[in-house]
Structures are given as C-alpha cells and as structure tokens.
C-alpha cells in the first residue's frame, strides 16, 4: 500500500539542459541501494515509465518509444530515465517517484541551427537561430575558429564571413546558470589567398596556382580567368573551364598566350613565357554549382627585362608594382649602383662585367636578372 507523498518529501527541482536530437539522462536515486518500485511522470501526471515486478513498463506518454532506463543500475538504487532523440517539445518538468519521495527535474531542450547552408561563400552572411522552449530566456555566445566572439539572443548574425571563419563554431547556450554547448561546422568557400603576385624575368615560364581554402567531396562548377595587361586598353578572357567532381576541363583558351591548365585540383595554369605584353593583373572567378555568387582570386604578373643597346644598359619592369619598390642596377663585386623608385633604370656607358638588375621591397629582393656587359674596344680611326 502506497503512502501519500507530503510537500516536505518533494526534493528541490533540478534543471537539466538538453540538445535537440541528442540523448539526455535524468537521474533519480533512492537512498537504499536496492531494486525498488519507481515511476517517471510528466508535469501532467502521465506515466512515462516505471517498474512492475522486475520489468520496465511504459505509460501512454508521447515519450514511450524514446524513453528507457538503465536496468543494470536498478539494484544500485539508480532509476534514471534516458530520453533519446530529444525534441524541443520534450521540455517539461519530469517527476521521479521513488521510496515515497518525488524528485523533480526540469528539462529544457534547445536547438541551434544555421538558417542557410553551412557552406557559404566568402562575404556572405551567416545566421544562427536558437530554438528554445516557451517561457525560457536563454542567452547565446558563439566563438569562431579564429577566436571572434559574438553574442545574441534567439538569433546570432555574422554579416560578412571571412576565410578564417571556416571551421567549427562553438556556441554556448546559458539558462538558469546552466549551459549547453553546440558545435556547428561552417565551410567558407574561398581561395586560400585573395591576391598573389608572380615576379618573373622575361622568357621564364610562369605558374599561377589557385588553391582552395576548403575541401568538398564533390566539387562542380565553372570558371574563367580575365586578364588586364598593363599595355592593353581593355581586359581579355584568357581561359574558361569547367570543374566536375574535382576534374578540370578547358572549354576555351586564348591563342596568345598559349596557356596550359592542369586537370587536377588545385587549379593551376602555366604561361609558356613571361613577356612584357603579358604583364598585368588577372581575376580568376569560380562559380560553384548550387551556390549564388562567385569565388575570386586576383593574380598579378610582374616581368623584368635587362637589355644593353649601344652605350645604354637598361632595366625595366612591367606590371603592377607598388611605388615603394626599388629598381636597381649594380655591378657585381663593385660599388657602382643606380637605384630608383621607378619602373626603369639605366646606366650610360656601363663598365664591363656582370651587372645585376634587382627589384626589391625594403631590402628584400623580389626579382633579379643578370646581364653581362662586354668591353667595347675603340674603333680604329680610318686613315
């Protein structure tokens, strides 16, 4: 025969936070470490599960197919209730009745989801929405992989995603001094570098590489490289290509220059030789299937030429160089040097020997070209 449970038998209510889709274990312990009768009910007094004899029985609640108990722990006086595949509507006060005592546990289930696809282009915005039970007033704090902290309530917005935002975001939901942690994987679709510059001597082969800052199982799309040569009045499409399951196939390529493109990732292009007429800047765009917008990478080509014509030794560079770069001509193992923050330097009547043309940035050599000046013998005067 069961005794009535008085108010003083009602233990203080515990608060447990759960995550949508996860499993939670609500504990209930008897004072005696032995198997005894227990029941779990919801706030409407509907039985969820309990013990009858030695068997677990389930009541008519909505949880019946998702609720369970650890039978192996019953003889230790532990009568927990496990709820699988949590739903927001599972948030409720659950009552465990054991040994004429009632233990109340308030379960609050939260869900945190990205409003859109978690694969977003650089510059696009990310919105995280918190699902929470009625009557709760949680706060959310998210930390990006790069260490950026963002706080919010029901929604958290990141207006412009950057490359370094790719990775696992850790979001902490707090309610009643309790916390639950969510991890959301965000992939920012971008090239590893926004811009790169290739420095080459005239005639050398040029390599352009466009590594992606992400990996996808299936990568499909199309791309194009537009080129604005310094000497040209308008830009020109150098190559268009398709990408299907990470395989690159060239659709159309300009005849001058005759580019080669690799068929495997990372996207890779080679130019047979660096020439002044190719110096300039390009923009490679990649449109991915089922994504709005395009990925961009800028690439610059700087070409150097050292020439000797009659009594003039000249060194020139073409392409996008910053005004702080220094161009110098110096004679090897000698002090003779001429330097300018310009795109051309020259020496009249240069001494014989090996001359070096150097393009430098604050002392760091970006590009060098050697040219040998042979001694010029005076022409004998005709009688």
């Amino acid at each position: 025969e069961q005794k009535l449970i008085s108010e003083e038998d009602l233990a203080a209510k515990k608060v447990v936070l759960g995550k949508k889709g996860d499993t939670v274990e609500l504990t209930c312990n008897a004072s005696q470490k032995k198997n005894t009768q227990f029941h779990w009910k919801n706030s409407n007094q509907i039985k969820i599960l309990g013990i009858q004899g030695l068997f677990l029985t389930k009541g008519p609640s909505k949880l019946s197919d998702r609720a369970d108990s650890r039978k192996s722990l019953w003889d230790q006086g532990c009568f927990s209730m496990i709820i699988k595949n949590l739903k927001i509507e599972d948030s409720d006060t659950y009552i465990c009745e054991v040994e004429n005592k009632k233990e109340e546990v308030e379960l609050l289930v939260f869900g945190l989801t990205a409003n859109s696809d978690t694969h977003l282009l650089e510059g696009q915005s990310l919105t995280l929405t918190l699902e929470s039970p009625p009557g709760s007033s949680p706060s959310v704090k998210c930390r990006s992989p790069g260490g950026k902290n963002i706080q919010g309530g029901r929604t958290i917005s990141v207006p412009q995603l950057e490359r370094q935002d790719s990775g696992t975001w850790t979001c902490t939901v707090s309610q009643d001094q309790k916390t639950v942690e969510f991890k959301i994987d965000i992939v920012v679709l971008a090239f590893q570098k926004a811009s790169s510059t290739v420095y080459k001597k005239e005639g050398e082969q040029v390599e352009f590489s466009f590594p992606l800052a992400f990996t996808l199982e299936k990568l499909t799309g199309s791309g194009e490289l537009w080129w604005q040569a310094e000497r040209a009045s308008s830009s020109k499409s150098w190559i268009t290509f398709d990408l299907k399951n990470k395989e690159v196939s060239v659709k159309r390529v300009t005849q001058d220059p005759k580019l080669q493109m690799g068929k495997k990732l990372p996207l890779h292009l080679t130019l047979p030789q660096a020439l002044p007429q190719y110096a300039g800047s390009g923009n490679l765009t990649l449109a991915l299937e089922a994504k709005t917008g395009k990925l961009h990478q800028e690439v610059n080509l700087v070409v150097m030429r050292a020439t000797q014509f009659q009594e003039n030794l000249t060194c020139e560079v073409w392409g996008p160089t910053s005004p702080k770069l220094t161009l110098s001509l110096k004679l090897e193992n000698k002090g003779a040097t001429v330097s300018k923050q310009a795109k051309a330097v020259w020496v009249l009547n240069p001494e014989a020997g090996m001359w070096q043309c150097l393009l430098s940035d604050s002392g760091q050599v970006l590009l060098e070209s050697n040219i040998k000046v042979v001694p010029t013998w005076p022409t004998p005067v005709q009688p």
């Epitope: 390599e207 299907k244 399951n245 395989e247 196939s249 690799g262 068929k263 495997k264 890779h268 080679t270």
Partner: antibody
Framework: EVQLLESGGGLVQPGGSLRLSCAAS????????MSWVRQAPGKGLEWVSG????????YYADSVKGRFIISRDISKNTLYLEMNSLRAEDTAVYYC????????????WGQGTLVTVSS | AIQMTQSPSSLSASVGDRVTITCRAS??????LGWYQQKPGKAPKLLIY???SLQSGVPSRFSGSGSGTDFTLTISSLQPEDFATYYC?????????FGQGTKLEIK
C-alpha cells in the same frame, strides 16, 4: 580483381575502319577515366585518346583527332575506339588503360590488340 | 601539347648498379608525372605516380623525384628483372604525352 580485355584488332586496308573494344571488370567503370595507348612495332608508347570518368568528356592526340572516336557503354562496362580513315602509321598494338582514382597514372593495362593497316 | 624529353635513349648497366633516367617537360606540370616499365611483348607497368609515389607492389629500389619541369627515376641497385624499357608520362593535362623511352640493357 581488375581486368581489361581488348578485342577487335586485325588487318585493315588504308582508308578503312575498325572498332576496338575493351571489356572492363573489377572496378567502378562508370566513374573511372580510361584511355587508349598504342605502340607501333619497335617504337615507343603513344597516348591516343581518353575519356573522363566524371563528365564523359573525350580527348584525342593531334595525330588521330577527327578520325578516331572514343566512347563507353556503362551498362556493358566496355570502352570503345572507333577508328576511321586508317593509315599505315596507325599500325600498332592498342592498349586500353585504366587511370588511378585520382588521375595519377595508369594502374591497369589490357594485354593489347594488334591493328595492322596495309594493302 | 606538352612535350616530354627523356634521356638517355639507351643505357648499359650491370646488376647492382645505380641507374638514373631523366625526363623534362616543355611546360611546368607540377608533380603530374608517372614512370612505366615495359618488357618486350608485354603491357607497360606503372612504377611511380605523382612524380614520387611508389605504386603498390613495386620494389622500393625504384624511386622518383622532381617537380615542375625536371623529373628523375632512380633504380638504386639494378636487379636482372629490371632490364626493360622505361617511359615517363605527363598526366598534367590532355593530350597526355609520353617520353621517347629509355632502353636499359645489360652491360
């Protein structure tokens, strides 16, 4: 076990046609890139034609462009090479070859089939 | 098309020798290069892929190196079964191209 078995070679007159087949088994034919490679008697290897696994795109060496057609029948796991306007210089042993999953070289080859173009 | 220049075209060596074969591409091809061995009347066999990766089942005396335009196949200690013809193949892009081959003969 991966197997590639070529057939369809033989003697053909200049200007004639021939269709080579390569029956494949032991791997996922539909997603693998495949190629035909030939070797003229006493000469080196020459890549002839290829078909992409991912998009079915076809590619040819300049020496056969416009005359040869590569194709595949996924339901039959078979690769084909349709050879038209054959010339004496097309005489060779033709091999069918399977590319590695990530397009790094040909890891499996057939035993080859001899095509002789002669009058 | 990318041209592949292989050297030497023939080579005489003895069992136990260290042998090196080189291949040069007319364009930068990253590491998209394979090495093949062919014996008379047989189909070629892949030895090295991606310039330096040893194909499964191939003895470790075979090694590959290089990147960009210059590549090398090295056999550290020649065995009797290694006398064959060796080819490089660029698979950077289509049309693929083979080197002319190097015939390795017994001295």
């Amino acid at each position: 076990e991966v197997q590639l078995l070529e057939s369809g070679g033989g003697l053909v007159q200049p200007g004639g046609s021939l269709r080579l087949s390569c029956a494949a088994s032991g791997f996922t034919f539909s997603t693998n890139a495949m190629s035909w490679v030939r070797q003229a008697p006493g000469k080196g290897l020459e890549w002839v034609s290829g078909i992409s696994g991912s998009n079915g795109n076809t590619y040819y060496a300049d020496s056969v462009k416009g005359r040869f057609i590569i194709s595949r029948d996924i339901s039959k796991n078979t690769l084909y090479l349709e050879m038209n306007s054959l010339r004496a210089e097309d005489t060779a042993v033709y091999y069918c070859a399977k590319e590695r999953d990530n397009w790094n070289g040909f890891d499996y080859w057939g035993q080859g089939t001899l095509v002789t173009v002669s009058s | 098309a990318i041209q592949m220049t292989q050297s030497p075209s023939s080579l005489s060596a003895s069992v136990g020798d260290r042998v090196t074969i080189t291949c040069r591409a007319s364009h930068v091809i990253r590491n998209d290069l394979g090495w093949y061995q062919q014996k008379p009347g047989k189909a070629p066999k892949l030895l090295i892929y991606a310039a330096s990766s040893l194909q499964s089942g191939v003895p470790s005396r075979f090694s590959g190196s290089g990147s960009g335009t210059d590549f090398t196949l090295t056999i550290s200690s020649l065995q009797p079964e290694d006398f064959a013809t060796y080819y490089c193949l660029q698979d950077y892009n289509y049309p693929y191209t083979f080197g002319q081959g190097t015939k390795l003969e017994i001295k």
